[in-house]
Interface confidence: medium
Amino acid sequence: KPHPAEGQWRAVDVVLDCFLAKDGAHRGALASSEDRARASLVLKQVPVLDDGSLEDFTDFQGGTLAQDDPPIIFEASVDLVQIPQAEALLHADCSGKEVTCEISRYFLQMTETTVKTAAWFMANMQVSGGGPSISLVMKTPRVTKNEALWHPTLNLPLSPQGTVRTAVEFQVMTQTQSLSFLLGSSASLDCGFSMAPGLDLISVEWRLQHKGRGQLVYSWTAGQGQAVRKGATLEPAQLGMARDASLTLPGLTIQDEGTYICQITTSLYRAQQIIQLNIQASPKVRLSLANEALLPTLICDIAGYYPLDVVVTWTREELGGSPAQVSGASFSSLRQSVAGTYSISSSLTAEPGSAGATYTCQVTHISLEEPLGASTQVVPPERRT
């Protein structure tokens, strides 16, 4: 394990509230409560970095859940793999985030003999707010029915504490489920994995899905990488050493926006992570006067922005006064450039008043940390030369 400059590594039990998808149930976002059972997942003795907040942390005690409808408890040992984002799962509550967790049966495309000797489950965990997402494949040994405790619906043996004991043999994770990058910049889409000794890495595949179309972006198999999207790179050395399958996309265009799927296939298992990549382009603003007539018209040109949503506000400030919002602006038709960015113009009839006034066109857009504005002074006709 790595040695951090500060803090100590400590092994803790990470307990998560989950749902177990019932066998044969339709798995998806709209699964009904009848299709899912309550479950708990206990990741046993996960090494996490203790920043001092784990002092009163106690390990999971089995059999303490006295409820009418007790959840199925999965105990998963992580001795065979690494869970690098365990801290995020552990501290989610404290940082005001939620962890969603769904467990489902995982079926191997293996011979009947192998399948009869063990059962597999997949656990998908996601930290809200764009945090990490982890997919685990857990294996439970299947033993004979003369065990004292047996789960009737799972058809699996239970430990003396009434839990289903499993070992995590494979995990695929991303640190960020959603990313935003500026048009033209370079993006790195994070995808890491860890597998039990004895498993071999077979392939890595990155796919992009956007507006109903799907396409291969990059594939690595049998030691050979192939970029379908020009410039896409994945560092083969990192695959073997760091178990890092992150994808780098240089020179982002609007066509790169969408849902990326990182799929890792080993000799036994396959799992994936989904990452949403959003492209942004910041607007540019120009403010000018249409004419120098009695009531001049101000034109605010806004160009080169993406995505579409933009808010334009006008304010007027007389000398010595405070800015006041002005209504009555009109908009030109929206234009889209070859690159996919948008442009629009907003116009406003200016009323300079007796002493003149400063007009500001302010643009608010998701790509901007703060609104972008352009101001210009409009003087009364008698003061113009």
């Epitope: 120009r286 006067l289 249409a290 004419n291 034109i299 972008l372 352009a374």
Partner: antibody, heavy 117, light 106 residues
Framework: DVQLQESGPGLVKPSQTLSLTCSVT?????????WHWIRQFPGNKLEWMGY???????NYNPSLKNRISITHDSSKNQFFLNLNSVTAEDTATYFC??????????WGQGTLVTVSA | ENVLTQSPAIMSASPGEKVTMTCSAS?????MHWYQQKSSTSPKLWIY???KLASGVPGRFSGSGSGNSYSLTISSMEAEDVATYYC?????????FGSGTKLEIK
């Protein structure tokens, strides 16, 4: 390729009007760019004077607002600078420039204007 | 108006040396742009939108910064980089230029 060329008198008397023309080739003035006048004083300080947009709208530097006028003639693909009531302080090299939202991507070669009696 | 202060005013560097010049704005701006001007020629757009290189600009040039503080860096000085570099802001009117950094070669 967009090209700009300044022309006009190299010597102007104080209190008179400085008039310069910028001829644009390779792009139509009304197609979507912004067309600026910028000057560089003898000490190399650069000053933005103002622009006229593709739609004919204008914006001027407040320090020149009462003296400056920028117009265009789309039929000749030219835009113009008029600066009245000039003084010796207006002695500078005057550049016309065009931009496609990426500020002054295209420049003329500049023309030196001396204000002197 | 937004005053842009460039430093140093004059600097010299040996071939291969890393060069960094800065531009400080009296008011925060969204982007900074840079122009290169060689003697007796018009300025050329060199870096726009803080960090994007204009067409034909060598990859040894880079731009960075945010808010009130921006910089232009040359990773390895070459003789052809001798020029005056001006920063420029287009976020607020009037549009303003910095006073320039004159880069010489040792």
């Amino acid at each position: 390729d967009v090209q700009l060329q300044e022309s006009g008198p190299g010597l102007v008397k104080p209190s008179q009007t400085l008039s310069l023309t910028c001829s644009v080739t390779g792009y139509s003035l009304t197609s979507g760019y912004f067309w600026h006048w910028i000057r560089q004083f003898p000490g190399n300080k650069l000053e933005w004077m103002g622009y006229i947009s593709y739609s004919g709208t204008t914006n001027y530097n407040p320090s020149l607002k009462n003296r400056i006028s920028i117009t265009h003639d789309s039929s000749k693909n030219q835009f113009f600078l008029n600066l009245n009531s000039v003084t010796a302080e207006d002695t500078a090299t005057y550049f016309c420039a065009g931009d496609d939202w990426d500020w002054f991507a295209y420049w003329g070669q500049g023309t030196l204007v001396t204000v002197s009696a | 108006e937004n005053v842009l202060t460039q430093s140093p005013a004059i600097m010299s560097a040996s071939p291969g040396e890393k060069v960094t010049m800065t531009c400080s704005a009296s008011s925060s701006v969204n982007y900074m742009h840079w122009y290169q001007q060689k003697s007796s020629t018009s300025p050329k757009l060199w870096i726009y939108d803080t960090s994007k290189l204009a067409s034909g600009v060598p990859g040894r040039f880079s731009g960075s910064g945010s808010g009130n503080s921006y910089s232009l860096t040359i990773s390895s000085m070459e003789a052809e980089d001798v020029a005056t570099y001006y920063c420029f802001q287009g976020s607020g009117y009037p549009l303003t230029f910095g006073s320039g950094t004159k880069l010489e070669i040792k």
